[in-house]
Interface confidence: medium
């Protein structure tokens, strides 16, 4: 017997060939499919691990498998030697026996061989299956490990580039902060210099203010002297008038009687036959106290008592409570008639208030209130208005309900600020409200974007300072 060979046929069965002289014996053995060793069970539906087993563990197990393989190989070789030895013995026996017994002997040998080979093959197949199973599992684990490593490498690279970017950004920001710090230091220096300059300026202004105060004191003294002179002059004029009226009454007794008639308002003056615009002397209700007022005997039927006029900025309207109470200015020009007189007058009977306005573009507008009166001084000359009509806005620019009157020394507004000081002039300020006809007078081309000008919001907005204003009253039944 010369040769012993194992191979695979086309349909996957294992072949064992034995060559003996001119005779060749082929044994076809069935495949032992799905044969698993009980020592290492294979679970087909096992859940795959998220991460591969430790690499060292895999290597160790591979070495164990290699050892098993080596042992199997040696064992197979021993088996082959044993078979060959047996075959030799049997062949000698066969040769000694008659040729006719050869077939029977061969069948017996074949059977023995087949049984032994089948047993060995089964064991070998089991081992092969185990090795294949383990190898496949190791390959999968290695693949997973490789993939996981690649993923981690990519993440590390991404993070590294992100860190680099952040470092770049950080250094850029650091530079920017340093630049800003430098700029801030320069600005602080500049502010300090400006502060020093301002302090110098303030001290200069303080000295100028002191000088002005001295001048004001001097002017006040001079003014007092002038007032006394004026008073004396007025007395002289009155004496002369009295002398003249005495001499006239001697000639014409009817004239003397007419001179003694007193007028409460311009409506009474108008009704008495005086229909010319001008300054007239009016008497306080239930009193002999007199006041000079301008009467408009032409506009809207005449009989209007002018209680305020602005037209050229010749009179300062930033006055005290007392001045607004008794009146100031010149009745033929800019003036305020006086809150006390207007309060007393408008509480005697029902009056209407007409406010006539002019802008710098030649436009005119008016607001007419059907009912107007002022409370007493105890109630801060609070304004009361009803029934607005006119062309200077459909909403009242004098806040409703009416507010108390405020001046620079009498703050009665609804603002935490002092509207009269801030916006200048005495007015029925709210907080501070949509109007102030006693504000600063601004000439043309300087009259816009002024918060403290002569304002009537619902006609011209908050920043427009008007050219001229007139406030006039007349009995409602005129």
């Amino acid at each position: 017997y010369n040769n012993f060979r194992k191979s695979m046929d086309s349909i996957g069965k294992k072949q064992y060939q034995v060559q003996h002289g001119s005779c060749s014996y082929t044994f076809l053995l069935p495949e032992m499919d799905n044969c698993r060793s009980s020592s290492s069970p294979y679970v087909s539906n096992a859940v795959q691990r998220d991460a591969p087993l430790e690499y060292d563990d895999s290597v160790q197990r591979l070495q164990v498998l290699e050892n098993i393989m080596e042992n199997n190989t040696q064992w197979l070789m021993k088996l082959e030697n044993y078979i060959q030895d047996n075959m030799k013995k049997e062949m000698v026996e066969i040769q000694q026996n008659a040729v006719q017994n050869q077939t029977a002997v061969m069948i017996e040998i074949g059977t023995n061989l087949l049984n032994q080979t089948a047993e060995q093959t089964r064991k070998l197949t089991d081992v092969e299956a185990q090795v294949l199973n383990q190898t496949t599992r190791l390959e999968l684990q290695l693949l997973e490990h490789s993939l996981s490593t690649n993923k981690l490498e990519k993440q590390i690279l991404d993070q590294t580039s992100e860190i680099n970017k952040l470092q770049d950004k950080n250094s850029f920001l650091e530079k920017k902060v340093l630049a800003m710090e430098d700029k801030h230091i320069i600005q602080l220096q500049s502010i300090k210099e400006e502060k020093d300059q301002l302090q110098v300026l303030v001290s200069k202004q303080n000295s100028i203010i002191e000088e002005l105060e001295k001048k004001i004191v001097t002017a006040t003294v001079n003014n007092s002297v002038l007032q006394k002179q004026q008073h004396d002059l007025m007395e002289t004029v009155n004496n002369l008038l009295t002398m003249m009226s005495t001499s006239n009454s001697a000639k014409d007794p009817t004239v003397a009687k007419e001179e003694q008639i007193s007028f409460r308002d311009c409506a009474e003056v108008f009704k008495s036959g005086h229909t010319t615009n001008g300054i007239y002397t009016l008497t306080f209700p239930n009193s002999t106290e007199e006041i000079k007022a301008y009467c408009d005997m032409e506009a809207g039927g005449g009989g209007w008592t002018i209680i305020q006029r602005r037209e050229d900025g010749s009179v300062d309207f930033q006055r005290t409570w007392k001045e607004y109470k008794v009146g100031f200015g010149n009745p033929s020009g800019e003036y305020w008639l006086g809150n006390e007189f207007v309060s007393q007058l408008t509480n005697q009977q029902r009056y209407v208030l007409k406010i006539h306005l002019k802008d710098w573009e030649g436009n005119e507008a008016y607001s007419l209130y059907e009912h107007f009166y002022l409370s007493s001084e105890e109630l801060n000359y609070r304004i009361h208005l009803k029934g607005l009509t006119g062309t200077a806005g459909k909403i009242s620019s004098i806040s409703q309900p009416g507010n108390d009157f405020s001046t620079k020394d009498g703050d009665n507004d609804k603002c935490i600020c002092k509207c009269s000081q801030m916006l200048t002039g005495g007015w029925w300020f709210d907080a501070c409200g949509p109007s102030n006809l006693n504000g600063m007078y601004y000439p043309q081309r300087q009259n816009t974007n002024k918060f403290n000008g002569i304002k009537w919001y619902y006609w011209k907005g908050s920043g427009y300072s008007l050219k001229a204003t007139t406030m006039m009253i007349r009995p409602a039944d005129f």
């Epitope: 949509p434 002024k450 908050s462």
Partner: nanobody
Framework: QVQLVESGGGLVQPGGSLRLSCAAS????????MHWVRQAPGKGLVWVSR????????SYADSVKGRFTISRDNAKNTLYLQMNSLRAEDTAVYYC?????????????WGQGTLVTVSS
């Protein structure tokens, strides 16, 4: 609190039209003058138009006169700006603003703005 919210902006072709709205809340809308102001990209604020409290008086910048119309609906507390014959130079963020009583012609409250882009 006082709030002004503009809407109606968007992309429009030259010669096209848009109507901007400004919804007001937190104050008596009918008592205040209202304005539209715009800011072109990289430029300063430019006054566009104003309307008085009752809508009877309006005024416009020369650059928009005859093309833009300001109006208001006091019942709905809303200010409008109808923009016709739009040009590329009208591209800007448009703000509505309230003129306060004592603000000296300035604006005491502004909206957040709405972008108008005029492009072919």
């Amino acid at each position: 609190q006082v709030q002004l919210v503009e809407s109606g902006g968007g992309l429009v072709q030259p010669g096209g039209s848009l109507r901007l709205s400004c919804a007001a809340s937190g104050f008596t809308f009918s008592s205040y003058w209202m304005h539209w102001v715009r800011q072109a990209p990289g430029k300063g604020l430019v006054w566009v138009s104003r309307i008085n409290s009752d809508g009877s008086s309006t005024s416009y910048a020369d650059s928009v006169k005859g093309r833009f119309t300001i109006s208001r609906d006091n019942a709905k507390n809303t200010l409008y700006l109808q923009m016709n014959s739009l040009r590329a130079e009208d591209t800007a963020v448009y703000y509505c603003a309230r003129e306060g009583y004592s603000s000296g012609g300035q604006f005491d409250y502004w909206g957040q703005g709405t972008l108008v882009t005029v492009s072919s």
